[in-house]
Interface confidence: low
């Protein structure tokens, strides 16, 4: 068990703060909830603290919760491939470029680390080149979320990881908006981190609303499990 992994044996409170600017539309989001890495479970509620969110909530799910991939459930035989927990408590920097097909792109930078007993994800997001009447700024996405696989590989040069995946957002007319994600994570601290073999995270997310919440918001339930590395031969013959 990595030293960081010991911090995730129970339920951990989560705080998410985002400052965003998409095509000049500026906004802030605050999120709170908890994560339980034993089950790979996240429960979070996000509120736009600046009024109405200028982009659809589903376009921010990867920035919020795929940002705290330290809550992913890594099976026993894969624990030596869990970069995310190994970087804690100092945390990691996570940067992404997200290309929305035939539309604009988001660039994000986040610091994910423990502040006291709370896991904090502080994010800056900049979006450019979006069409004002496109699927994103035109709010044409359905309020739901598909399951995805998130592909992880070591980046030995930067003592971190590179991550690639493609998100499929459902559009109200029945078509799909693709969003290509290019991600890199680097540790904030100087301590040793686990550099993984290639594997993936399998994600399932459910979006809902709080009937008592008047502000623009999103409630998120997510389960994430690591997969893609089989038991070694020594395991088979135990």
């Amino acid at each position: 068990m990595s030293k960081g992994e010991e911090l995730f044996t129970g339920v951990v409170p989560i705080l998410v703060e985002l400052d965003g600017d998409v095509n000049g539309h500026k906004f802030s989001v605050s999120g709170e909830g908890e994560g339980d890495a034993t089950y790979g479970k996240l429960t979070l509620k996000f509120i736009c603290t600046t009024g109405k969110l200028p982009v659809p909530w589903p376009t921010l799910v990867t920035t919020f919760s795929y940002g705290v991939q330290c809550f992913s459930r890594y099976p026993d035989h894969m624990k030596q491939h869990d970069f995310f927990k190994s970087a804690m408590p100092e945390g990691y920097v996570q940067e992404r470029t997200i290309f929305f097909k035939d539309d604009g792109n988001y660039k994000t930078r986040a610091e994910v680390k423990f502040e006291g007993d709370t896991l904090v994800n502080r994010i800056e997001l900049k979006g450019i080149d979006f069409k004002e009447d496109g699927n994103i700024l035109g709010h044409k996405l359905e309020y739901n979320y598909n399951s995805h696989n998130v592909y992880i590989m070591a980046d030995k040069q930067k003592n971190g990881i590179k991550v690639n995946f493609k998100i499929r957002h459902n559009i109200e007319d029945g078509s799909v908006q693709l969003a290509d994600h290019y991600q890199q994570n680097t540790p904030i601290g100087d301590g040793p981190v686990l550099l993984p073999d290639n594997h993936y995270l399998s994600t399932q997310s459910a979006l809902s609303k709080d009937p008592n919440e008047k502000r623009d918001h999103m409630v998120l339930l997510e389960f994430v499990t690591a997969a893609g590395i089989t038991h070694g031969m020594d395991e088979l013959y135990k």
């Epitope: 920097v93 940067e95 660039k107 930078r109 800056e124 997001l125 900049k126 680097t186």
Partner: nanobody, 121 residues
Framework: ESGGGSVQAGGSLRLSCAAS????????MAWFRQAPGKEREGVAA????????YYADSVKGRFTISQDNAKNTVYLQMNSLEPEDTSIYYC???????????????????WGQGTQVTVSS
């Protein structure tokens, strides 16, 4: 921007960027440079709120970025200049905190007109 000019290798220059219509006390201020035929590259950045600084590997230990909130000005002190530092230097500002590794010019909302720095051997 001001403070550019010509200097011998090993010399020093101090660039200044006075922001008008923009308050440097929050967000990110940065210096970029662009040599002829090359991509614009991030040199240094400072988070105005807490003073955290970031530097490109090529200038670490030689360049220092600083700010004076009272004068709404950001500085780039350049020491031990090398011919490879010859470029047009641009000041940039963002309302958001600095990106960790200076990668993206699109992060910044405001840009200066640039000042030429020439270092001869």
């Amino acid at each position: 921007e001001s403070g550019g000019g010509s200097v011998q290798a090993g010399g020093s220059l101090r660039l200044s960027c006075a922001a008008s219509g923009y308050t440097v006390s929050r967000g990110c201020m940065a210096w970029f440079r662009q040599a002829p035929g090359k991509e614009r590259e991030g040199v240094a950045a400072i988070n105005s709120g807490d003073g955290t600084t970031y530097y490109a590997d090529s200038v670490k230990g030689r360049f220092t970025i600083s700010q004076d909130n009272a004068k709404n000005t950001v500085y780039l002190q350049m020491n031990s200049l090398e011919p490879e530092d010859t470029s047009i230097y641009y000041c940039a500002a963002s309302r958001l905190r600095c990106p960790w590794n200076l990668v993206s010019a699109s992060w910044y909302d405001f840009w200066g007109q640039g000042t030429q720095v020439t270092v001869s051997s």
